[in-house]
Interface confidence: low
Protein backbone atom coordinates (compact mmCIF):
# COMPACT_ATOMS: atom_id res chain seq x y z
CA UNK A 1 0.00 0.00 0.00
CA UNK A 2 1.53 3.35 -1.00
CA UNK A 3 2.16 5.72 1.90
CA UNK A 4 0.78 8.65 -0.08
CA UNK A 5 -2.09 8.66 -2.49
CA UNK A 6 -3.73 11.60 -4.23
CA UNK A 7 -7.07 12.30 -2.56
CA UNK A 8 -9.60 13.50 -5.11
CA UNK A 9 -12.93 15.13 -4.33
CA UNK A 10 -15.10 12.67 -6.23
CA UNK A 11 -16.14 9.09 -5.47
CA UNK A 12 -13.68 6.35 -6.37
CA UNK A 13 -13.96 3.75 -9.11
CA UNK A 14 -17.18 1.75 -8.97
CA UNK A 15 -16.74 -1.54 -7.13
CA UNK A 16 -16.13 -4.51 -9.44
CA UNK A 17 -15.57 -2.10 -12.33
CA UNK A 18 -13.63 -4.54 -14.57
CA UNK A 19 -16.17 -7.32 -14.02
CA UNK A 20 -19.08 -4.96 -14.64
CA UNK A 21 -17.66 -3.61 -17.90
CA UNK A 22 -16.90 -7.10 -19.19
CA UNK A 23 -20.29 -8.45 -18.11
CA UNK A 24 -22.15 -5.55 -19.71
CA UNK A 25 -20.16 -5.96 -22.91
CA UNK A 26 -21.00 -9.65 -23.15
CA UNK A 27 -24.66 -8.97 -22.40
CA UNK A 28 -24.86 -6.24 -25.01
CA UNK A 29 -23.14 -8.21 -27.75
CA UNK A 30 -25.35 -11.22 -27.08
CA UNK A 31 -28.51 -9.16 -27.39
CA UNK A 32 -27.43 -7.16 -30.45
CA UNK A 33 -26.58 -9.57 -33.27
CA UNK A 34 -24.86 -6.80 -35.24
CA UNK A 35 -22.31 -6.50 -32.41
CA UNK A 36 -21.67 -10.23 -31.94
CA UNK A 37 -18.29 -9.88 -33.65
CA UNK A 38 -17.01 -7.69 -30.79
CA UNK A 39 -14.39 -9.34 -28.58
CA UNK A 40 -15.25 -8.14 -25.10
CA UNK A 41 -11.84 -8.94 -23.67
CA UNK A 42 -10.30 -6.61 -26.26
CA UNK A 43 -12.91 -3.98 -25.41
CA UNK A 44 -11.97 -4.18 -21.74
CA UNK A 45 -8.26 -4.05 -22.57
CA UNK A 46 -8.85 -0.91 -24.67
CA UNK A 47 -11.01 0.66 -21.96
CA UNK A 48 -8.37 -0.06 -19.33
CA UNK A 49 -5.61 1.22 -21.61
CA UNK A 50 -7.33 4.60 -21.83
CA UNK A 51 -6.79 5.47 -18.17
CA UNK A 52 -4.53 2.97 -16.39
CA UNK A 53 -1.07 4.33 -15.47
CA UNK A 54 -2.14 7.81 -16.62
CA UNK A 55 -2.59 10.89 -14.51
CA UNK A 56 -6.35 11.15 -14.02
CA UNK A 57 -6.32 14.86 -14.82
CA UNK A 58 -4.43 14.44 -18.09
CA UNK A 59 -6.75 12.20 -20.06
CA UNK A 60 -7.38 13.08 -23.71
CA UNK A 61 -9.87 11.97 -26.35
CA UNK A 62 -6.89 10.36 -28.04
CA UNK A 63 -6.56 7.96 -25.10
CA UNK A 64 -10.02 6.58 -25.89
CA UNK A 65 -9.51 6.14 -29.63
CA UNK A 66 -8.69 2.39 -29.46
CA UNK A 67 -11.89 1.85 -27.49
CA UNK A 68 -13.89 4.02 -29.91
CA UNK A 69 -12.60 1.97 -32.80
CA UNK A 70 -13.59 -1.34 -31.19
CA UNK A 71 -17.00 0.03 -30.22
CA UNK A 72 -17.83 1.44 -33.64
CA UNK A 73 -21.53 0.94 -34.15
CA UNK A 74 -24.06 2.05 -36.70
CA UNK A 75 -27.36 3.26 -35.29
CA UNK A 76 -30.11 4.68 -37.54
CA UNK A 77 -28.99 8.30 -37.74
CA UNK A 78 -32.59 9.58 -37.88
CA UNK A 79 -33.63 7.75 -34.69
CA UNK A 80 -31.41 9.49 -32.16
CA UNK A 81 -32.75 10.77 -28.84
CA UNK A 82 -30.52 13.13 -26.88
CA UNK A 83 -31.37 14.10 -23.31
CA UNK A 84 -30.30 16.52 -20.62
CA UNK A 85 -30.88 16.06 -16.90
CA UNK A 86 -33.71 13.58 -17.53
CA UNK A 87 -31.94 10.33 -18.22
CA UNK A 88 -34.43 7.93 -16.63
CA UNK A 89 -37.41 9.07 -18.68
CA UNK A 90 -35.32 9.07 -21.88
CA UNK A 91 -34.32 5.48 -21.17
CA UNK A 92 -37.87 4.46 -20.32
CA UNK A 93 -38.93 5.95 -23.66
CA UNK A 94 -36.39 4.02 -25.75
CA UNK A 95 -37.22 0.84 -23.83
CA UNK A 96 -40.73 1.19 -25.27
CA UNK A 97 -39.93 2.90 -28.58
CA UNK A 98 -37.36 0.29 -29.55
CA UNK A 99 -36.40 1.91 -32.84
CA UNK A 100 -35.03 5.02 -31.10
CA UNK A 101 -31.67 5.20 -29.39
CA UNK A 102 -30.09 7.18 -26.59
CA UNK A 103 -26.32 7.12 -26.20
CA UNK A 104 -26.77 4.58 -23.41
CA UNK A 105 -28.49 2.23 -25.86
CA UNK A 106 -25.21 1.95 -27.79
CA UNK A 107 -22.47 -0.42 -26.70
CA UNK A 108 -20.07 2.21 -25.37
CA UNK A 109 -22.78 4.18 -23.58
CA UNK A 110 -24.21 1.01 -22.07
CA UNK A 111 -20.78 -0.09 -20.81
CA UNK A 112 -20.13 3.10 -18.87
CA UNK A 113 -23.61 4.19 -17.77
CA UNK A 114 -23.61 5.17 -14.06
CA UNK A 115 -20.02 4.01 -13.56
CA UNK A 116 -16.99 5.90 -12.26
CA UNK A 117 -13.36 5.01 -12.93
CA UNK A 118 -9.84 6.35 -12.73
CA UNK A 119 -6.28 5.17 -12.34
CA UNK A 120 -3.03 6.57 -10.97
CA UNK A 121 0.00 7.96 -12.72
CA UNK A 122 2.74 5.38 -13.22
CA UNK A 123 0.97 2.49 -11.46
CA UNK A 124 -1.28 -0.16 -12.93
CA UNK A 125 -3.73 0.23 -10.05
CA UNK A 126 -7.36 1.26 -10.37
CA UNK A 127 -8.18 3.92 -7.78
CA UNK A 128 -11.16 2.69 -5.76
CA UNK A 129 -10.74 5.40 -3.11
CA UNK A 130 -11.41 8.60 -5.02
CA UNK A 131 -11.47 10.06 -8.54
CA UNK A 132 -11.28 13.67 -9.75
CA UNK A 133 -14.44 15.74 -9.58
CA UNK A 134 -15.15 17.73 -12.75
CA UNK A 135 -15.66 21.00 -10.86
CA UNK A 136 -13.45 20.65 -7.81
CA UNK A 137 -10.46 18.89 -9.35
CA UNK A 138 -10.19 18.85 -13.15
CA UNK A 139 -12.30 18.48 -16.28
CA UNK A 140 -9.90 16.21 -18.16
CA UNK A 141 -10.64 13.22 -15.97
CA UNK A 142 -11.29 9.72 -17.35
CA UNK A 143 -15.08 9.78 -16.94
CA UNK A 144 -15.68 13.30 -18.28
CA UNK A 145 -13.40 12.80 -21.27
CA UNK A 146 -15.08 9.48 -22.06
CA UNK A 147 -18.56 11.02 -22.09
CA UNK A 148 -17.35 14.03 -24.04
CA UNK A 149 -15.83 11.72 -26.65
CA UNK A 150 -18.78 9.36 -27.07
CA UNK A 151 -21.31 12.22 -26.91
CA UNK A 152 -19.48 14.11 -29.65
CA UNK A 153 -19.37 11.05 -31.89
CA UNK A 154 -23.04 10.28 -31.22
CA UNK A 155 -24.11 13.82 -32.13
CA UNK A 156 -21.90 13.82 -35.23
CA UNK A 157 -23.67 10.66 -36.44
CA UNK A 158 -27.16 12.17 -36.18
CA UNK A 159 -29.25 13.10 -39.23
CA UNK A 160 -32.70 14.34 -40.32
CA UNK A 161 -34.81 15.05 -37.22
CA UNK A 162 -32.95 14.75 -33.93
CA UNK A 163 -34.96 14.71 -30.70
CA UNK A 164 -33.83 15.95 -27.30
CA UNK A 165 -35.61 15.44 -24.00
CA UNK A 166 -35.19 18.32 -21.54
CA UNK A 167 -36.19 18.59 -17.90
CA UNK A 168 -38.82 21.31 -17.46
CA UNK A 169 -38.53 21.13 -13.67
CA UNK A 170 -35.04 22.61 -13.60
CA UNK A 171 -34.27 26.31 -13.31
CA UNK A 172 -32.23 26.05 -16.51
CA UNK A 173 -34.26 23.86 -18.83
CA UNK A 174 -31.47 24.19 -21.37
CA UNK A 175 -28.08 24.42 -19.69
CA UNK A 176 -25.13 25.45 -21.84
CA UNK A 177 -22.80 23.69 -19.40
CA UNK A 178 -24.48 20.29 -19.69
CA UNK A 179 -23.06 17.63 -22.00
CA UNK A 180 -25.95 18.33 -24.36
CA UNK A 181 -25.35 22.10 -24.28
CA UNK A 182 -21.57 22.05 -24.43
CA UNK A 183 -20.87 19.05 -26.65
CA UNK A 184 -23.84 17.60 -28.52
CA UNK A 185 -25.44 20.84 -29.72
CA UNK A 186 -22.16 21.96 -31.27
CA UNK A 187 -21.50 18.66 -32.99
CA UNK A 188 -24.80 18.25 -34.81
CA UNK A 189 -23.89 18.44 -38.50
CA UNK A 190 -25.96 21.11 -40.34
CA UNK A 191 -25.48 19.36 -43.67
CA UNK A 192 -27.11 16.22 -42.24
CA UNK A 193 -29.47 17.44 -39.52
CA UNK A 194 -32.60 19.21 -40.68
CA UNK A 195 -34.37 19.79 -37.35
CA UNK A 196 -33.72 19.56 -33.63
CA UNK A 197 -36.99 18.88 -31.84
CA UNK A 198 -37.00 19.53 -28.10
CA UNK A 199 -39.43 17.74 -25.81
CA UNK A 200 -39.77 19.71 -22.60
CA UNK A 201 -40.93 17.39 -19.84
CA UNK A 202 -43.19 18.95 -17.21
CA UNK A 203 -42.82 17.90 -13.59
CA UNK A 204 -45.88 19.39 -11.93
CA UNK A 205 -49.28 17.73 -12.28
CA UNK A 206 -51.08 21.06 -12.83
CA UNK A 207 -48.31 22.79 -14.73
CA UNK A 208 -49.91 24.11 -17.92
CA UNK A 209 -47.33 26.78 -18.75
CA UNK A 210 -45.79 26.78 -22.21
CA UNK A 211 -42.21 25.96 -21.25
CA UNK A 212 -41.19 26.24 -24.91
CA UNK A 213 -41.27 30.00 -24.28
CA UNK A 214 -38.69 29.70 -21.50
CA UNK A 215 -35.70 32.03 -22.01
CA UNK A 216 -33.24 29.11 -21.99
CA UNK A 217 -35.23 27.36 -24.74
CA UNK A 218 -35.11 30.58 -26.74
CA UNK A 219 -31.35 30.54 -26.18
CA UNK A 220 -31.17 26.97 -27.50
CA UNK A 221 -33.26 27.97 -30.51
CA UNK A 222 -30.91 30.79 -31.40
CA UNK A 223 -27.81 28.57 -31.02
CA UNK A 224 -29.40 25.91 -33.22
CA UNK A 225 -30.64 28.33 -35.88
CA UNK A 226 -27.21 29.93 -35.98
CA UNK A 227 -25.94 26.50 -36.90
CA UNK A 228 -28.39 26.44 -39.81
CA UNK A 229 -30.62 23.79 -38.21
CA UNK A 230 -34.36 24.23 -37.75
CA UNK A 231 -35.73 24.11 -34.23
CA UNK A 232 -39.07 22.95 -32.92
CA UNK A 233 -40.33 22.45 -29.39
CA UNK A 234 -43.13 20.48 -27.73
CA UNK A 235 -44.41 20.52 -24.17
CA UNK A 236 -44.90 17.09 -22.63
CA UNK A 237 -47.36 18.03 -19.90
CA UNK A 238 -47.99 14.48 -18.68
CA UNK A 239 -44.86 12.31 -18.95
CA UNK A 240 -46.70 9.29 -17.50
CA UNK A 241 -49.44 9.58 -20.12
CA UNK A 242 -46.80 10.25 -22.78
CA UNK A 243 -45.11 6.91 -22.05
CA UNK A 244 -48.45 5.15 -21.85
CA UNK A 245 -49.41 6.51 -25.27
CA UNK A 246 -46.10 5.44 -26.77
CA UNK A 247 -46.89 1.93 -25.49
CA UNK A 248 -50.54 2.04 -26.65
CA UNK A 249 -50.90 4.68 -29.39
CA UNK A 250 -54.37 3.39 -30.33
CA UNK A 251 -55.75 4.32 -26.89
CA UNK A 252 -58.58 6.85 -27.40
CA UNK A 253 -57.19 9.21 -24.75
CA UNK A 254 -53.97 9.57 -26.75
CA UNK A 255 -55.43 11.90 -29.34
CA UNK A 256 -55.64 14.70 -26.78
CA UNK A 257 -52.66 16.79 -25.77
CA UNK A 258 -50.07 15.08 -23.58
Amino acid sequence: VPRWRQQWSGPGTTKRFPETVLARCVKYTEIHPEMRHVDCQSVWDAFKGAFISKHPCNITEEDYQPLMKLGTQTVPCNKILLWSRIKDLAHQFTQVQRDMFTLEDTLLGYLADDLTWCGEFNTSKINYQSCPDWRKDCSNNPVSVFWKTVSRRFAEAACDVVHVMLNGSRSKIFDKNSTFGSVEVHNLQPEKVQTLEAWVIHGGREDSRDLCQDPTIKELESIISKRNIQFSCKNIYRPDKFLQCVKNPEDSSCTSEI
Epitope: T20, A23, R24, V26, K27, C40, Q95
Partner: antibody
Framework: EVQLLESGGGFVQPGGSLRLSCAAS????????MNWVRQAPGKGLEWVSS?????????WYADSVKGRFTISRDNSRNTLYLQMNSLRAEDTAIYYC?????????????WGQGTTVTVSS | EIVLTQSPGTLSLSPGERATLNCRAS??????LAWYQQKPGQAPRLLIY???NRATGIPDRFSGSGSGTDFSLTISRLEPEDFAVYYC??????????FGGGTKVEIK
Amino acid sequence: EVQLLESGGGFVQPGGSLRLSCAASGFTFTNYVMNWVRQAPGKGLEWVSSISISGGRYTWYADSVKGRFTISRDNSRNTLYLQMNSLRAEDTAIYYCAREMNTYSFPMDVWGQGTTVTVSS
Amino acid sequence: EIVLTQSPGTLSLSPGERATLNCRASQNVRSDLAWYQQKPGQAPRLLIYDASNRATGIPDRFSGSGSGTDFSLTISRLEPEDFAVYYCQQYYDWPPYTFGGGTKVEIK
Protein backbone atom coordinates in the same frame (compact mmCIF):
# COMPACT_ATOMS: atom_id res chain seq x y z
CA GLU B 1 -42.66 -27.29 -24.70
CA VAL B 2 -39.79 -25.30 -23.17
CA GLN B 3 -38.25 -27.39 -20.41
CA LEU B 4 -35.20 -27.65 -18.14
CA LEU B 5 -34.46 -30.86 -16.24
CA GLU B 6 -31.73 -31.01 -13.60
CA SER B 7 -29.98 -34.17 -12.40
CA GLY B 8 -26.85 -35.23 -10.54
CA GLY B 9 -27.72 -34.13 -7.03
CA GLY B 10 -27.14 -36.37 -4.05
CA PHE B 11 -25.43 -36.89 -0.74
CA VAL B 12 -21.71 -36.07 -0.49
CA GLN B 13 -19.17 -35.58 2.30
CA PRO B 14 -17.43 -32.24 2.93
CA GLY B 15 -14.51 -31.85 0.52
CA GLY B 16 -16.21 -34.10 -2.04
CA SER B 17 -17.33 -33.38 -5.60
CA LEU B 18 -20.53 -33.56 -7.63
CA ARG B 19 -21.44 -32.72 -11.18
CA LEU B 20 -24.92 -31.37 -11.87
CA SER B 21 -26.51 -31.50 -15.32
CA CYS B 22 -29.41 -29.59 -16.81
CA ALA B 23 -30.99 -30.90 -20.01
CA ALA B 24 -32.73 -28.24 -22.08
CA SER B 25 -35.46 -28.82 -24.64
CA GLY B 26 -38.05 -26.88 -26.61
CA PHE B 27 -35.86 -23.87 -27.44
CA THR B 28 -32.62 -22.99 -29.24
CA PHE B 29 -30.23 -23.62 -26.36
CA THR B 30 -27.23 -21.81 -27.89
CA ASN B 31 -29.10 -18.50 -27.99
CA TYR B 32 -29.60 -18.19 -24.25
CA VAL B 33 -27.52 -17.23 -21.26
CA MET B 34 -27.91 -19.97 -18.64
CA ASN B 35 -27.71 -19.72 -14.85
CA TRP B 36 -27.48 -21.84 -11.73
CA VAL B 37 -29.40 -20.57 -8.71
CA ARG B 38 -29.58 -22.35 -5.36
CA GLN B 39 -31.82 -22.36 -2.32
CA ALA B 40 -30.63 -23.58 1.07
CA PRO B 41 -33.26 -25.36 3.19
CA GLY B 42 -35.83 -22.84 4.43
CA LYS B 43 -33.89 -19.93 2.92
CA GLY B 44 -34.15 -17.57 -0.06
CA LEU B 45 -32.70 -17.72 -3.56
CA GLU B 46 -28.99 -17.21 -4.23
CA TRP B 47 -27.47 -16.78 -7.69
CA VAL B 48 -24.51 -19.13 -8.19
CA SER B 49 -23.18 -18.86 -11.72
CA SER B 50 -23.90 -17.76 -15.31
CA ILE B 51 -22.52 -18.72 -18.71
CA SER B 52 -22.74 -16.73 -21.92
CA ILE B 53 -24.44 -17.91 -25.10
CA SER B 54 -23.01 -20.08 -27.86
CA GLY B 55 -19.64 -21.48 -26.82
CA GLY B 56 -19.87 -20.02 -23.33
CA ARG B 57 -16.73 -17.93 -23.70
CA TYR B 58 -17.61 -15.96 -20.56
CA THR B 59 -18.55 -17.32 -17.14
CA TRP B 60 -19.39 -15.63 -13.85
CA TYR B 61 -19.57 -16.89 -10.29
CA ALA B 62 -20.82 -15.76 -6.89
CA ASP B 63 -17.93 -15.03 -4.53
CA SER B 64 -19.08 -17.90 -2.30
CA VAL B 65 -18.32 -20.52 -4.97
CA LYS B 66 -15.52 -18.90 -6.97
CA GLY B 67 -12.57 -21.25 -7.47
CA ARG B 68 -14.60 -24.31 -6.41
CA PHE B 69 -17.44 -24.48 -8.94
CA THR B 70 -17.18 -24.54 -12.74
CA ILE B 71 -20.09 -23.88 -15.09
CA SER B 72 -19.98 -25.22 -18.66
CA ARG B 73 -22.29 -26.04 -21.52
CA ASP B 74 -22.39 -28.63 -24.29
CA ASN B 75 -24.49 -27.17 -27.07
CA SER B 76 -24.44 -30.40 -29.08
CA ARG B 77 -26.22 -32.07 -26.16
CA ASN B 78 -28.31 -29.03 -25.14
CA THR B 79 -26.94 -29.48 -21.65
CA LEU B 80 -25.68 -27.15 -18.93
CA TYR B 81 -23.29 -28.41 -16.24
CA LEU B 82 -22.08 -27.36 -12.81
CA GLN B 83 -18.95 -29.09 -11.56
CA MET B 84 -18.80 -28.65 -7.78
CA ASN B 85 -15.53 -29.38 -5.99
CA SER B 86 -14.38 -28.91 -2.38
CA LEU B 87 -17.97 -28.99 -1.22
CA ARG B 88 -18.90 -27.50 2.15
CA ALA B 89 -21.89 -27.94 4.46
CA GLU B 90 -23.11 -24.46 3.43
CA ASP B 91 -23.42 -25.65 -0.19
CA THR B 92 -26.35 -27.84 0.87
CA ALA B 93 -29.30 -26.61 -1.20
CA ILE B 94 -31.68 -27.25 -4.04
CA TYR B 95 -29.87 -26.26 -7.25
CA TYR B 96 -31.98 -24.85 -10.06
CA CYS B 97 -30.88 -24.20 -13.60
CA ALA B 98 -32.60 -21.21 -15.18
CA ARG B 99 -32.73 -19.67 -18.62
CA GLU B 100 -32.30 -15.95 -19.00
CA MET B 101 -34.74 -13.95 -21.10
CA ASN B 102 -33.24 -13.16 -24.49
CA THR B 103 -34.33 -9.52 -24.48
CA TYR B 104 -33.00 -6.19 -23.29
CA SER B 105 -33.57 -7.36 -19.74
CA PHE B 106 -32.12 -10.35 -17.98
CA PRO B 107 -34.59 -11.97 -15.59
CA MET B 108 -34.85 -15.76 -15.57
CA ASP B 109 -37.98 -16.82 -17.38
CA VAL B 110 -37.66 -20.62 -17.41
CA TRP B 111 -36.60 -22.72 -14.40
CA GLY B 112 -36.01 -26.41 -13.88
CA GLN B 113 -37.58 -28.31 -11.01
CA GLY B 114 -34.28 -28.41 -9.09
CA THR B 115 -31.92 -31.11 -7.84
CA THR B 116 -30.98 -31.50 -4.16
CA VAL B 117 -27.38 -31.47 -2.97
CA THR B 118 -26.67 -32.46 0.64
CA VAL B 119 -23.17 -32.01 2.04
CA SER B 120 -22.75 -33.69 5.40
CA SER B 121 -20.40 -36.00 7.23
CA GLU C 1 -23.29 -5.66 -4.49
CA ILE C 2 -26.84 -4.36 -4.43
CA VAL C 3 -28.90 -5.46 -1.44
CA LEU C 4 -32.65 -5.92 -1.89
CA THR C 5 -34.83 -5.63 1.20
CA GLN C 6 -38.37 -6.99 0.99
CA SER C 7 -41.20 -5.99 3.30
CA PRO C 8 -43.18 -7.18 5.03
CA GLY C 9 -41.62 -10.56 5.80
CA THR C 10 -45.09 -12.14 6.06
CA LEU C 11 -48.44 -10.89 4.84
CA SER C 12 -51.58 -12.53 6.30
CA LEU C 13 -54.59 -11.93 4.09
CA SER C 14 -57.84 -13.55 2.99
CA PRO C 15 -58.77 -14.58 -0.54
CA GLY C 16 -60.26 -11.64 -2.45
CA GLU C 17 -58.15 -9.08 -0.59
CA ARG C 18 -55.49 -6.85 -2.16
CA ALA C 19 -51.82 -7.58 -1.44
CA THR C 20 -48.99 -5.07 -1.76
CA LEU C 21 -45.42 -6.32 -1.45
CA ASN C 22 -42.43 -3.98 -1.34
CA CYS C 23 -38.83 -4.27 -2.44
CA ARG C 24 -36.18 -1.64 -1.74
CA ALA C 25 -32.77 -1.60 -3.44
CA SER C 26 -29.67 -0.27 -1.68
CA GLN C 27 -28.88 1.75 -4.82
CA ASN C 28 -30.52 2.76 -8.09
CA VAL C 29 -31.37 -0.24 -10.29
CA ARG C 30 -33.41 1.76 -12.84
CA SER C 31 -36.22 -0.57 -13.94
CA ASP C 32 -34.08 -3.70 -13.96
CA LEU C 33 -36.10 -5.62 -11.40
CA ALA C 34 -38.12 -8.85 -11.57
CA TRP C 35 -40.65 -10.54 -9.28
CA TYR C 36 -40.94 -14.32 -8.84
CA GLN C 37 -43.51 -16.52 -7.15
CA GLN C 38 -42.51 -19.74 -5.42
CA LYS C 39 -44.86 -22.34 -3.99
CA PRO C 40 -43.68 -25.08 -1.59
CA GLY C 41 -41.80 -27.83 -3.40
CA GLN C 42 -41.82 -25.93 -6.69
CA ALA C 43 -39.31 -23.85 -8.66
CA PRO C 44 -39.68 -20.06 -8.79
CA ARG C 45 -41.89 -18.66 -11.56
CA LEU C 46 -41.28 -15.31 -13.26
CA LEU C 47 -44.22 -12.93 -12.76
CA ILE C 48 -42.95 -9.45 -13.61
CA TYR C 49 -39.82 -8.17 -15.38
CA ASP C 50 -38.48 -4.67 -16.05
CA ALA C 51 -40.38 -3.60 -12.90
CA SER C 52 -43.81 -3.50 -14.55
CA ASN C 53 -44.07 -5.96 -17.47
CA ARG C 54 -46.06 -9.13 -16.90
CA ALA C 55 -44.36 -12.33 -18.06
CA THR C 56 -46.14 -14.57 -20.55
CA GLY C 57 -49.23 -16.24 -19.12
CA ILE C 58 -49.34 -14.22 -15.90
CA PRO C 59 -52.89 -13.08 -14.95
CA ASP C 60 -53.53 -9.34 -14.97
CA ARG C 61 -54.32 -9.29 -11.23
CA PHE C 62 -50.51 -9.17 -10.82
CA SER C 63 -48.92 -5.78 -11.45
CA GLY C 64 -45.54 -4.27 -10.72
CA SER C 65 -44.51 -0.65 -10.29
CA GLY C 66 -41.58 1.51 -9.27
CA SER C 67 -38.15 2.46 -10.54
CA GLY C 68 -34.86 3.49 -9.02
CA THR C 69 -34.81 2.07 -5.51
CA ASP C 70 -38.46 1.48 -4.54
CA PHE C 71 -40.64 -1.17 -6.12
CA SER C 72 -43.90 -2.90 -5.37
CA LEU C 73 -45.84 -5.94 -6.51
CA THR C 74 -49.61 -5.73 -6.23
CA ILE C 75 -52.06 -8.62 -6.38
CA SER C 76 -55.41 -6.92 -6.87
CA ARG C 77 -57.61 -9.80 -5.64
CA LEU C 78 -55.95 -12.76 -3.99
CA GLU C 79 -56.90 -16.14 -5.39
CA PRO C 80 -56.29 -19.34 -3.37
CA GLU C 81 -53.39 -20.25 -5.68
CA ASP C 82 -51.61 -16.93 -4.99
CA PHE C 83 -50.59 -17.86 -1.44
CA ALA C 84 -46.85 -18.40 -1.81
CA VAL C 85 -43.46 -16.76 -1.27
CA TYR C 86 -42.55 -13.83 -3.55
CA TYR C 87 -38.99 -12.75 -4.37
CA CYS C 88 -37.67 -9.65 -6.11
CA GLN C 89 -34.41 -9.79 -8.11
CA GLN C 90 -32.26 -7.03 -9.62
CA TYR C 91 -30.29 -7.45 -12.82
CA TYR C 92 -28.95 -3.92 -13.22
CA ASP C 93 -25.63 -4.21 -11.41
CA TRP C 94 -24.31 -7.56 -12.45
CA PRO C 95 -22.50 -9.76 -11.44
CA PRO C 96 -23.83 -10.78 -9.01
CA TYR C 97 -27.56 -10.99 -9.55
CA THR C 98 -29.18 -10.48 -6.16
CA PHE C 99 -32.54 -11.51 -4.74
CA GLY C 100 -34.57 -10.10 -1.88
CA GLY C 101 -35.17 -12.21 1.20
CA GLY C 102 -38.76 -12.96 0.19
CA THR C 103 -42.27 -12.11 1.38
CA LYS C 104 -44.58 -14.93 2.42
CA VAL C 105 -48.24 -14.34 1.57
CA GLU C 106 -50.27 -16.64 3.83
CA ILE C 107 -53.96 -17.26 4.39
CA LYS C 108 -55.33 -15.33 7.35
